[in-house]
């Protein structure tokens, strides 16, 4: 057992032992994004396959109206892409009076929402400002890193237009965690 | 034992426990391309470094003809980066008759090859319009996500321009996969 | 136990187990950079927040002065995203004597010592060229693998110019590890 | 329920103006390019013009036809979008309606209003 | 500006026939997307992102193409089907829709 001879000599907290398989673990893939409520003042939410494809939820993490739920408390790795796609910027154009135009920019946010807390956090941001000429572009925001959660928090994936996000393929857009 | 006096009360399903240092893993690096045939209708594969540097292959996964063959079903996170330069582009140029250019563009994909099945998959994708003006350019594309894969799965990392890419260092091109 | 009848037919090395819980493992977020010494010849060190936010420590894994120190050898994943902002860039100028100028750039790595070595191992870079026209500009550069590290090696993420780096929010700019 | 009511039309000489209103509901307008998209009797769709959001300072965007007479602009707060149309010919005659924009289409469109330019 | 020419402009159709109409772009488009009219009707969407049937849309109906030359097909007609079918750019400003093709049952 854990703690016993294999224990290496610094080890002194005996921790439940864990199989891998039954960590909680999910990836979503895009689907076509129609106007939906959101919360006010606050980036829209995208929705997503759960199941379908290459999408999969197990282990009791749960997805449902465009939040993941955490099922168990530890450190979990998070991740998205989000693949954006637009028109011609116009951020090029002549500066009036001498002054550079605010940019275009398109912004991912993986959120965690906590009931007993008033406000989201924001846990990861990808923003880049768009400033492309001469032709249509597209281009993925990828973000990842680990967050120690909580049993019952939420996370969901806002992007700052919603309009521009390419859902044509499950492999350009997506979102996804895992206990690790 | 797993199951006993540590198990979280929610836990019913008793896997078999598994040693962290024994679980496929591999990291491989970029070296330089040479031309070789590739599927009709498909981006080039690239072909990597397993041994040397900061490349390894472990615990059965192993490397072979620019796939990496997965030992072991389960759930694997996969990832790449792909450094790209090029000349400039000229999807900026006066547009004729007041066209847009179609957008130069490059694009990443990890794609998984399974012997019964006729058609690769492709696992993830990312992929940008190149429309830089006035000098050279070099960018990177990163990937990284979760997939249930099946023992005997090959995977591979295709590119829209072989010769766009920048094998000059190995932390630039990357590749790697591991059994969580 | 590992080894007894749930142990996969193949598996024929007794590695000891280990809880996931008490593996080394980090999560810094940025804070803003005060000008420091660095190494001549190497972009500068990046310092970071361990403890405040969504900023941990956790089993033996420290930072200090710049670095997280590994406690314990192993496989790490090891990430950073770093959001970069500027001015309008000038490299898309029209070009001297016919010759594109060297554009402006952006460059991460993540780098690791080791007491024992002379020189340190960039085990991750992203680099891209700016060449944004018209206004001022920001985008990230997301970078992230696994490697083999040995107990007190450490990691630094060096950038190629600390004045550009968005040190504003926690969620844009970040840097963390785990033992897999 | 995702719902448009577009309001505003009526007779107008040419030369003339007049204002339309796109009240939205059942979605967060905020968060939607917002276009107007009329129609001649008889005659086939024509797009008219669009705005984008708050974080893209309101750009907006005309057909060749309009640019210049027309402007369209919009209240977040009230949930409405408006087509402020001066300069009219009798050519602008028909029924206007607004639809938010998605990057695929657009999904939703009002019952329309009629603009009459005639003297 | 983007023009889309749709052909025909009219076609008479008895049902259960193949149908055919297709949508030239003056220059590439990234998707093109296809909306349904009827009269006294506001339209609806149809067709998106060139392959993709609209909630509701039957799956008689399918739409093919890439670059400046697009489709859409009903591989047997029926008689709700006739309608006013437009195509509709939105890969470059200004957007445009093309002039429209009426489709009658015989």
């Known amino acids: 057992l854990k703690g016993q001879e294999f224990a290496p000599s610094h080890q002194q907290v005996y921790a439940p032992l864990r199989a891998d398989g039954d960590k909680p673990r999910a990836h979503l893939t895009v689907v076509r994004q129609t106007p939906t409520q959101h919360f006010k003042n606050q980036f829209p939410a995208l929705h997503w396959e759960h199941e379908l494809g290459l999408a999969f939820t197990k282990n009791r993490m749960n997805y449902t109206n465009k939040f993941l739920l955490i099922p168990e408390s530890g450190d979990y790795f998070i991740y998205s892409q989000v693949t954006f796609r637009g028109m011609t910027s116009e951020c090029s154009e002549i500066r009036q009076a001498g002054r550079p135009n605010k940019p275009d920019s398109i912004t991912v946010v993986i959120t965690k929402v906590t009931d007993s807390y008033p406000e989201p956090t924001q846990l990861l941001m990808g923003t880049k400002s768009v400033c492309e000429v001469g032709s249509n572009w597209f281009q993925p925001i990828y973000l990842g890193a680990m967050f120690s959660l909580q049993e019952g928090d939420k996370l969901m994936v806002n992007v700052s237009d919603i309009s521009l996000v390419d859902y044509t393929k499950e492999d350009k857009t997506f979102f996804g965690a895992f206990l690790l | 034992l797993k199951g006993q006096e540590f198990a979280p009360s929610h836990q019913q399903v008793y896997a078999p426990l598994r040693a962290d240092g024994d679980k496929p893993r591999a990291h491989l690096t970029v070296v330089r391309q040479t031309p070789t045939q590739h599927f009709k209708n498909q981006f080039p594969a690239l072909h990597w470094e397993h041994e040397l540097g900061l490349a390894f292959t472990k615990n059965r996964m192993n490397y072979t003809n620019k796939f990496l063959l997965i030992p072991e079903s389960g759930d694997y996170f996969i990832y790449s980066q792909v450094t790209f330069r090029g000349m400039t582009s000229e999807c900026s140029e006066i547009r004729q008759a007041g066209r847009p250019n179609k957008p130069d563009s490059i694009t990443v994909v990890i794609t998984k090859v399974t012997d019964s099945y006729p058609e690769p998959t492709q696992l993830l994708m990312g992929t940008k319009s190149v429309c830089e003006v006035g000098s050279n350019w070099f960018q990177p594309i990163y990937l990284g996500a979760m997939f249930s894969l099946q023992e005997g799965d090959k995977l591979m990392v295709n590119v829209s321009d072989i010769s766009l890419v920048d094998y000059t260092k190995e932390d630039k091109t990357f590749f790697g996969a591991f059994l969580l | 136990l590992k080894g007894q009848e749930f142990a996969p037919s193949h598996q024929q090395v007794y590695a000891p187990l280990r809880a996931d819980g008490d593996k080394p493992r980090a999560h810094l977020t940025v804070v803003r950079q005060t000008p420091t010494q660095h190494f001549k010849n190497q972009f500068p060190a990046l310092h970071w927040e361990h403890e405040l936010g969504l900023a941990f420590t956790k089993n033996r894994m420290n930072y200090t002065n710049k670095f997280l120190l590994i406690p314990e050898s192993g496989d790490y994943f090891i990430y950073s995203q770093v959001t970069f902002r500027g001015m309008t860039s000038e490299c898309s100028e029209i070009r001297q004597a016919g010759r594109p100028n060297k554009p402006d750039s952006i460059t991460v790595v993540i780098t690791k010592v080791t007491d024992s070595y002379p020189e340190p191992t960039q085990l991750l870079m992203g680099t891209k060229s700016v060449c944004e026209v018209g206004s001022n500009w920001f985008q990230p550069i997301y970078l992230g693998a696994m490697f083999s590290l040995q107990e007190g090696d450490k990691l630094m993420v060096n950038v190629s110019d600390i004045s550009l780096v968005d040190y504003t929010k926690e969620d844009k700019t970040f840097f963390g590890a785990f033992l897999l | 329920e995702v719902q448009l009511v577009e309001s505003g039309g009526g007779l107008v000489q040419p030369g003339g103006s007049l204002k339309l209103s796109c009240a939205a509901s059942?979605?967060?307008?905020?968060?939607?390019?917002m276009n107007w998209v009329r129609q001649a009797s008889g005659k086939g769709l024509e797009w008219v013009g669009g705005?984008?959001?708050?974080?893209?300072?309101?750009?907006?965007q005309y057909a060749e036809s309009v640019k210049g007479r027309f402007t369209i602009s919009r209240d977040d707060s009230k949930n409405t979008a408006y087509l402020q149309m001066n300069s009219l010919k009798t050519e602008d005659t028909a029924v206007y309606y607004c639809?938010?924009?998605?990057?695929?289409?657009?999904?939703?469109w009002g019952q329309g209003t009629t603009v009459t330019v005639s003297s | 500006e983007i023009v889309l020419t749709q052909s025909p402009d009219f076609q008479s159709v008895t049902p259960k026939e193949k149908v055919t109409i297709t949508c030239s772009a003056s220059s590439s488009v990234s998707y093109m997307h296809w909306y349904q009219q009827k009269p006294d009707q506001s339209p609806k969407l149809w067709i998106y992102d060139t392959s993709n049937l609209a909630s509701g849309v039957p799956s008689r109906f399918s739409g093919s193409g890439s670059g400046t030359d697009f489709t859409l097909t009903i591989n047997s007609l029926e008689a709700e089907d006739a309608a006013t079918y437009y195509c509709f750019q939105e890969s470059g400003y200004p957007f445009t829709f093309g002039q429209g093709t009426k489709l009658e049952i015989k």
């Open positions: 059942g979605f967060t307008f905020s968060n939607y390019w």
């Open positions: 705005i984008r959001l708050k974080s893209n300072n309101y750009k907006t």
């Open positions: 639809t938010p924009l998605l990057l695929s289409g657009m999904d939703y």
